[in-house]
């Protein structure tokens, strides 16, 4: 095939190659950018920048290699547009720092850095605890910083990310107070600051206040709905990203459903409570307490992170006839209590019949008088209590 | 697969207190009710009580409830049986075993408890 | 509390024969569990709600019964049935256990 003259030249399917020099200075406008997999580019002295716009439309990018080139600087977002990269190589160019939110992200299987004069400092704490964890084949570069000896022996006793408090109210909140929440930020080189509120939809009112060091958060006339949900603060510096999340838990009253009993591996009596604190649970049968054992038992269901609801099943594994009856569940909390009922049917009573009903018999009985008493079975009559906390 | 291990032998003189483990393993722990049955030398099986790790539920034999203890550590899925006042007659091998839905599924091979003076 | 009898107390057959274990309650439960034991070992549950086989039991066992009076069958014995079989009610505390049958296979 006769040499290709472009600056850029295809490199089998789906591969390009930009090796002439100095024919590039930024990557706008490449030939067959959204389908390219494997980028090669090399002797580029006017290529310094890497930033979001020089990537955007590589979205099928998974090798990309810069090299013997003079790039200087790669934006904190440059490869958000390529989240598939897997292998990116800058090694000998003018790189002195990369910043840790380049990498963010991505699954780098590798990533070359060597022959690059690059400056110790935190802000390559992160690249350091690559090479310590074994990552991204960074140990095998063993990496110098220029004039510095060995980033692996780089001091990082202060290199740590911000160090976050988040102080919430202590006494208990209700449904429509309003609630301020403060954040304090503390470390060295603090860039960025703020909330994640994802999870409030539509909990509270939000109002955000201050800044750094300090970021204030008051959620107006919160709802119940806040239980449960996160509210994060977080904070950037060179070294890396940390957060904190708490939550508020606003008080209400206990409510509950019951639900009509269904066989399900043995029977099950569904009910739902909920209520803030989590409320204690009691079992009525016909009236008087229910005494839980491992044939008649209270079971929960797995519950849902983000809500105080929490579902479960009253378990009888063998009723029969003696358990028919009107159960009634309680649910109590400091803040109010509440109960449900349902009549329960499991077996009919083998003891139980109609005197005015016809006995079958095969011949004319003398006497028909019947009587019907009392079933034969009876309960363990004790009576205890028992409390089931939910939560 | 589901493991209920008892601890070892025990030897103890009368009125004596004696603490059997069963050390849980292969299901989730605090599902299950676990029950704690003595057979006495040659002779059948006799219930001492039960207990829910879930929320700490015991019901005892009251034959036994003023004697036996029924804990339950669920940080390490172990269930505790301990017996106070021991007499000769409780010389007996001590079993737990596990319930959900149906009865006794699962137990624990048994520490023999030798009270003797 | 419930009493379970269990009757015989000892029940001497032959390979091939049929044998019927019976438990007697003290009044009525809703439901009949039974154990195999082994000389040695735990007991093994081996049939539950009256009349399920629990895993690995063959076939030629099986359970019926209602109210008071509950049955364990083995169609035809074989020589590893020998074994001494409990029953036990969970409907009511305290769980009681029968005295036990003892089968021997001659």
């Known amino acids: 095939a006769a040499p290709c003259p472009d600056a850029c030249c295809p490199h089998g399917s789906s591969g390009l190659r930009c090796t002439r020099d100095g024919a590039l200075d930024s990557l706008h406008h490449l030939p067959g950018a959204e389908n390219l997999t494997e980028l090669y580019i090399e002797n580029q002295q006017h290529l310094q920048h890497l930033e979001l716009r020089d990537l955007r439309g590589l979205g099928e990018l998974r090798n990309l290699t810069i090299v013997k080139s003079g790039l200087r600087f790669v934006a904190p977002d440059a490869f958000h547009f390529t989240p598939r990269l897997s292998r990116l190589n800058l090694s000998f160019n003018a790189l002195e720092s990369l910043s840790w939110k380049t990498v963010q992200g991505l699954s780098l299987q590798e990533l070359v850095l060597s022959g690059n004069p690059l400056h110790c400092s935190c802000a390559l704490r992160w690249l350091q605890r690559w090479e310590e964890e074994g990552l991204g084949g960074v140990p095998e570069q063993k990496l110098q910083c220029h004039g510095q000896g060995p980033l692996a022996h780089m001091p990082n006793a202060s290199c740590g990310v911000p160090t976050l408090k988040v102080q919430v109210p202590n006494a208990s909140v209700d449904v429509g107070d309003d609630v301020l929440l403060r954040c304090q930020v503390e470390g060295r080189g603090l860039e960025q600051a703020g909330w994640i509120l994802t999870e409030l939809e539509q909990s509270a009112t939000v109002m955000k206040s201050g800044g750094l060091p300090s970021l204030g958060l008051t959620l107006a006339n919160v709802t119940s709905d806040l239980n449960r949900k996160n509210v994060t603060c977080w904070a950037e510096n060179d070294v890396g990203r940390a957060e904190v999340s708490v939550q508020v838990n606003v008080s209400f009253p206990a409510s509950v459903q019951l639900h009509t009993a269904v066989e399900m591996h043995h029977w099950c009596i569904p009910f739902s409570v909920d209520g803030q604190p989590a409320p204690s649970l009691r079992w009525l049968f016909n009236g008087s307490v229910l005494n839980e054992t491992s044939f008649i038992f209270t079971e929960f269901l797995e519950p849902a992170a983000n809500e105080t609801v929490r579902h479960g099943c009253l378990r009888l594994n063998q009723p029969t006839h003696v358990n028919n009856g009107n159960y009634t569940l309680l649910a109590a909390n400091p803040f109010g209590q509440a109960s449900a009922s349902i009549m329960a049917a499991f077996m009919d009573n083998p003891f139980e019949f109609n005197p005015e009903d016809p006995i079958p018999v095969s011949f004319s009985p003398v006497d028909t008088n019947s009587t019907s008493g009392d079933p034969v079975e009876k309960k363990d009559e004790t009576p205890f209590g028992v409390s089931v906390a939910v939560g | 697969q589901v493991q209920l291990v008892q601890s070892g032998a025990e030897v103890k003189k009368p009125g004596a207190s004696v603490k059997v483990s069963c050390k849980s393993s292969?299901?989730?722990?605090?599902?299950?009710?676990m029950h704690w049955v003595r057979q006495a030398p040659g002779q059948g099986l006799e219930w001492i009580g039960e207990?829910?790790?879930?929320?700490?539920?015991?019901n005892y034999n009251e034959k036994f409830k003023n004697r036996a203890t029924l804990t339950v550590d669920i940080s390490i899925s172990t269930a505790y049986m301990e017996l106070s006042r021991l007499r000769s007659d409780d010389t007996a091998v001590y079993y737990c075993?596990?319930?959900?839905?149906?009865?006794?599924?699962?137990w624990g091979q048994g520490t023999t408890v030798t009270v003797s003076s | 509390e419930v009493v379970l009898t269990q009757s015989p107390a000892t029940l001497s057959l032959s390979p091939g024969e049929r044998a019927t274990l019976s438990c007697s309650a003290s009044?009525?439960?809703?439901?009949m569990h039974w154990y195999q034991q082994k000389p040695g070992q735990a007991p093994r549950r081996w049939i539950y709600?009256?009349?399920k086989l629990a895993s690995g039991v063959p076939a030629r066992f099986s359970g019926s019964g209602s109210g008071t009076d509950y049955t364990l069958t083995i169609s035809s014995l074989e020589p590893e049935d020998a074994a001494v079989y409990f029953c036990?009610?969970?409907?009511?505390?305290?769980?009681?256990f029968g005295q036990g049958t003892r089968l021997e296979i001659k």
């Open positions: 075993a596990r319930s959900r839905y149906d009865p006794m599924e699962d």
């Open positions: 292969g299901y989730t722990f605090t599902n299950y009710w």
């Open positions: 207990i829910y790790p879930n929320n700490g539920r015991v």
């Open positions: 009044s009525s439960v809703g439901y």
């Open positions: 709600d009256t009349s």
């Open positions: 036990q009610q969970w409907s009511s505390i305290p769980l009681t």
